[in-house]
Amino acid sequence: LVPHLGDREKRDSVCPQGKYIHPQNNSICCTKCHKGTYLYNDCPGPGQDTDCRECESGSFTASENHLRHCLSCSKCRKEMGQVEISSCTVDRDTVCGCRKNQYRHYWSENLFQCFNCSLCLNGTVHLSCQEKQNTVCTCHAGFFLRENECVSCSNCKKSLECTKLCLPQIENVKGTEDSGTT
């Protein structure tokens, strides 16, 4: 199956790479604008220059294009704990990230929130914290993993998953009590 091409892609595919078809005259191929610039006026004829203008402050284009407007720079989402890694330039969007010892949790394709990496208290680090993944902890004996934290088996209720992990501990406690001498 051949994927369906949009009108713009169809028009572009007629011209060699780095050029696009003139919107009013499909016999003319105009040179695309460099990154950091946008299309102000199409080329007047074959072999003539396309009128490209530099993006204004607060906007960018990251690749060669024939856009009529530059794209607005992204803003880092402070309410998501994001910080600016590098600011927007005419040819590159703002890069947002998280602080040291934090990882990104993606709520959707383009939206992430920063969370603190787990420290694995009462356990050991099985896998270190990554840019997009929290630390993976392994808990010490007598502790079980709940919401990526090692919690004491004394907090394990019968209805919870932890009963399997804490069973030996619970049995030991019972055994000690039962075998008590008077």
Partner: nanobody, 116 residues
């Protein structure tokens, strides 16, 4: 067929509490992050809170932080929003929504009115 049914709204005095529920069906609930979104009279939609698949990750809008708590019970296919210290500005229709990528499914909403 995907269905999201909100309940628990009503009239409450400032400073009061309400607990909203959203019963989900027609999809594997535990496979999706869920959200509460609200729309105040004559205003646009506002994110209230998100919750991740297992409930570990949560997000709250600054306007509700410290007052609202989102939770989920995957065994009951239900999303909750505990709302405490309610204010007049919390008056809105509250919707639960599935899949934060495209919000293709919404409930019909439940009205919360905070008034003395």
């Amino acid at each position: 067929e995907v269905q999201l049914l909100e309940s628990g709204g009503g009239l409450v005095q400032p400073g009061g509490s309400l607990r909203l529920s959203c019963a989900a069906s027609g999809f594997t609930f535990e496979d999706y992050p869920m959200a509460w979104v609200r729309q105040a009279p004559g205003k646009g939609l506002e994110w209230v809170s998100f919750i991740g698949l297992k409930g570990i990750h949560t997000y709250y809008a600054d306007s509700v932080k410290g007052r609202f708590t989102i939770s989920r019970d995957n065994s009951k296919n239900t999303l909750y929003l505990q709302m405490n210290s309610l204010r007049a500005e919390d008056t809105a229709v509250y919707y639960c929504a599935k899949d934060l990528n495209n919000f293709d499914y919404w409930g019909q909403g439940t009205l919360v009115t905070v008034s003395s």
